[in-house]
Amino acid sequence: QDCSAQCQCAAEAAPHCPAGVSLVLDGCGCCRVCAKQLGELCTERDPCDPHKGLFCDFGSPANRKIGVCTAKDGAPCVFGGSVYRSGESFQSSCKYQCTCLDGAVGCVPLCSMDVRLPSPDCPFPRRVKLPGKCCEEWVCDEPKDRTAVGPALAAYRLEDTFGPDPTMMRANCLVQTTEWSACSKTCGMGISTRVTNDNTFCRLEKQSRLCMVRPCEADLEENIKKGKKCIRTPKIAKPVKFELSGCTSVKTYRAKFCGVCTDGRCCTPHRTTTLPVEFKCPDGEIMKKNMMFIKTCACHYNCPGDNDIFESLYYRKMYGDMA
């Protein structure tokens, strides 16, 4: 695609995209456009929605002109008795537009959660559900005595004016965050992910953090006391430095790890927190990565089978994360 020509956008102002559709830069980095959705035609100039894990599938390498927006492989979602593909958008009700992203559903309200402040034209604004309308609408009760607008105003109820508490919501965003997934490795450095729209633009995004349930080299079964079947949180004798792709953590950490059992149970993180860890690489580069730190572990029989695609929910989810 030729981006050498001067940028020319269809309109000076950014387009107004429908609910749940991202506003993105075109392939030339010139103009802001509404991202194409799952199954729609796309070009390098009209990109697919990256916040839904979509990419423009051009089919054969020779064809770089027109493609179809396709979802990167991700887990489907079950919502309200229906199955949705990762990247697929759907309306869960007249009030919400939802998107499936790798097994998690995030929704944005289609109804305005706008606040109305009192004015001479509408001294006592209230939100009410009108017959035949999906969304609540503002109505303006006229003051009983027009001459008493001033003194009467002091007596209106705050919640009548505001509707929902504005501190509880980002404007027009139903904030949702999934639990952290289980660590991708049962020993050594792995990845744990979650999906959230807790960001400035209420966009679904996948967040990841490093995780280590236990070091691979530790022979934890040796430490199980006689008569006991499990060691839930073994004591690690010395502080450790984490390693990632040849880079080493700048600080040492006295981290907690989960132990093992001899009776078929497995021990997994139960309460965790997320903290940034700086890694120094051989070339001197410093990179900062979020990492899971274990607070407590739990030993249970809900262990994932090697081929079990419906891994136990208990195992897949990380409870009580503070971040």
Epitope: L117, P118, S119, P120, D121, W138, V149, G150, A154, T161
Partner: antibody
Framework: EVQLQESGPGLVKPSQTLSLTCTVS????????VHWIRQHPGKGLEWLGV???????DYNAAFMSRLTISKDTSKNQVSFKLSSVTAADTAVYYC????????WGQGTTVTVSS | ETVVTQEPSLTVSPGGTVTLTCRSS?????????ANWVQQKPGQAFRGLIG???NRAPWTPARFSGSLLGGKAALTLSGVQPEDEAEYYC?????????FGGGTKLTVLG
């Protein structure tokens, strides 16, 4: 998402009529009124007039004789017409939503010059 | 002609408290003046902070509060943040029209 966008010619000749449009999205102009305000370069704000949700209007007395504000609810647009303009009308013109003047347009610069 | 007067400029240190006022030339400001406070940060659009004397817009932090104080409309900022540095305008309603104040330039030191 609530948005207001002013549009119109950037240059108007003296004695002509200045016509601006405020295009609204994210709310209905039959539910909220729309105000017009202007700001001279390096100066404060000056309220010009308002069209209320039910279509009634109120104007700054100083502009009463030459200002008309109207609306097209089907297009969710408010129009602003200021006649017999002079160089003193050179300013940035804004539309804003009623109710605490909570949302404003980015403004449109109007220069009156021959 | 009704005139609405604001302090031209005020300076405050981060974490401090400052009160901006809005005086009417024709008497005490009351709730029927529907005092509004509008903010403009450098390079940004105007946005309303307070409407109807004391009601915060959804984006207005709790450290901003609107009230009537000694016959004037007042905007009080408690625990001032560097990002509060801006121009603040008040607007008062007089039965048939609004009048804007001249604006207050708030500078946050440091």
């Amino acid at each position: 998402e609530v948005q207001l966008q002013e549009s119109g010619p950037g240059l108007v000749k003296p004695s002509q009529t200045l016509s601006l449009t405020c295009t609204v999205s994210g709310f209905s102009i039959s539910t909220f009124g729309v105000h017009w305000i202007r700001q001279h370069p390096g100066k404060g704000l000056e309220w010009l007039g308002v069209i209320w949700r039910r279509g009634g209007t109120d104007y700054n007395a100083a502009f009463m004789s030459r200002l008309t504000i109207s609306k097209d609810t089907s297009k969710n647009q408010v129009s602003f017409k200021l006649s017999s303009v002079t160089a003193a009308d050179t300013a940035v013109y804004y539309c804003a939503r009623d109710g605490g003047f909570d949302y404003w347009g980015q403004g449109t610069t109007v220069t009156v010059s021959s | 002609e009704t005139v609405v007067t604001q302090e031209p400029s005020l300076t405050v240190s981060p974490g401090g408290t400052v009160t901006l006022t809005c005086r009417s030339s024709i008497g005490a400001v009351t709730t029927s003046n529907y005092a509004n406070w509008v903010q403009q940060k450098p390079g940004q659009a105007f946005r309303g902070l307070i409407g109807g004397t004391s009601n915060r817009a959804p984006w207005t932090p709790a450290r901003f509060s609107g009230s009537l104080l000694g016959g004037k409309a007042a905007l009080t900022l408690s625990g001032v943040q560097p990002e509060d540095e801006a121009e603040y305008y008040c607007a008062l309603w007089y039965s048939t029209h609004y009048v804007f104040g001249g604006g207050t330039k708030l500078t946050v030191l440091g």
